[in-house]
Interface confidence: medium
């Protein structure tokens, strides 16, 4: 079965006008000696194993949280954007237990 890594919105620093990055300052494990990690770009799983995962939506990968999710088309919701809404949902069940 496919393992989905959920995504959360990366927050912005309040000094964003001085810093073009939308990510918080982070400490990345491994450092310079982490098998040349600095020069190795991580593969986007949306282009590989999650390519066809989102049914009515677009796969999104947020690298700084190592997380994948589906950005749903307007009328769809759910983990894979597979459920169609009859009306606006003010409350969505967040329990994504497998």
């Amino acid at each position: 079965s496919v393992r989905v890594e959920q995504v959360v919105k990366p927050p912005q620093n309040k000094t964003e006008s001085e810093n073009t990055s939308d990510k918080p300052k982070r400490k990345k494990k491994g450092g310079k000696n982490g098998k040349n990690r600095r020069n190795r770009k991580k593969k986007n799983p949306c282009n590989a194993e999650f390519q066809n995962f989102c049914i009515h939506g677009e796969c999104k990968y947020i690298e700084h949280l190592e997380a994948v999710t589906c950005k749903c088309q307007q009328e769809y919701f759910g983990e894979r954007c597979g459920e169609k809404s009859m009306k606006t949902h003010s409350m969505i069940d967040s329990s994504l237990s497998k």
Epitope: R3, V4, E5, Q6, V7, V8, K9, P10, P11, Q12, N13, K14, E16, D22, P24, K25, R26, K27, K28, K29, G30, H64, L65, E66, A67, T69, C70, K71, C72, Q74, F77, E79, H89, S90, I92, S94, S95, L96, S97, K98
Partner: antibody, heavy 124, light 112 residues
């Protein structure tokens, strides 16, 4: 049912160290970023640390940076907080919290489930 | 850091009444993506905080519809249309638009 159970708290002297653990169940632990939040004796809530799903990226406020280390073991469904150079102002109830998105058109960043907490007292 | 202010510290209400809890941030909480990452939590006596409202006005799973959130920019409000006994506790607002993430000091909802 999402369940988060913290342990490892206790009484420690200033300058000492302590390692907190949080056992997670009821959801796919490896799929969620996780955080630690503390509540001071005055009942103020303070964000302490956040870790990405795979543990590669960690985030801290300046107040604990360099002293606290958040980590996770996805095979054991466990989150950790290693605390060193402890100060009296670190005295608090420490909560483990899931960064759980509800996705409907776009995502948000909030702590949707919290454990019951473990108490840390730093005193000589 | 963004300062979240929640006056008053205590809000006495009668059961069945409407309650209104305010939260003000020291800077705008509108993210560059257009969203406002302002959330509300309830901490009942002896319990851990529970998420009630996310992104200003969206009720979390299982939260009764008597709870509603509103506001924009720097001023936000949580309304409880008919207060029930289980609603008593401390309400915290929280922002995750800016790093570090910060919380308000809390407003205690108690019986008049």
């Amino acid at each position: 049912e999402v369940k988060l159970v913290e342990s490892g708290g206790g009484l420690v002297k200033p300058g000492g160290s302590l390692k907190l653990s949080c056992a997670a169940s009821g959801f796919t632990f490896s799929s969620y970023p996780m955080s630690w939040v503390r509540q001071t004796p005055e009942k103020r809530l303070e964000w302490v640390a956040t870790i990405s799903t795979g543990g590669t990226y960690t985030y801290y406020p300046d107040s604990v940076k360099g002293r606290f280390t958040i980590s996770r073991d996805n095979a054991k469904n466990t989150l950790y907080l290693q605390m060193s150079s402890l100060r009296s102002e670190d005295t608090a109830m420490y909560y483990c919290a899931r960064q759980g998105p509800i996705y409907y058109g776009n995502y948000y960043y909030a702590m949707d489930y919290w454990g019951q907490g473990t108490s840390v007292t730093v005193s000589s | 850091d963004i300062v979240m202010t929640q006056p008053p510290l205590s809000l006495p209400v009668s059961l069945g009444d409407q309650a209104s809890i305010s939260c003000r941030s020291s800077q705008s909480l509108v993210h560059s993506d257009g969203n406002t990452y302002l959330h509300w939590y309830l901490q009942r006596p002896g319990q851990s905080p529970k998420l009630l409202i996310y992104k200003v006005s969206n009720r979390f799973s299982g939260v009764p519809d008597r709870f509603s959130g509103s506001g924009s920019g720097t001023d936000f409000t949580l309304k409880i249309s008919r207060v029930e006994a289980e609603d008593l506790g401390v309400y915290f607002c929280s922002q995750s638009t800016h790093v570090p993430y910060t919380f308000g000091g809390g407003t205690k909802l108690e019986i008049k």
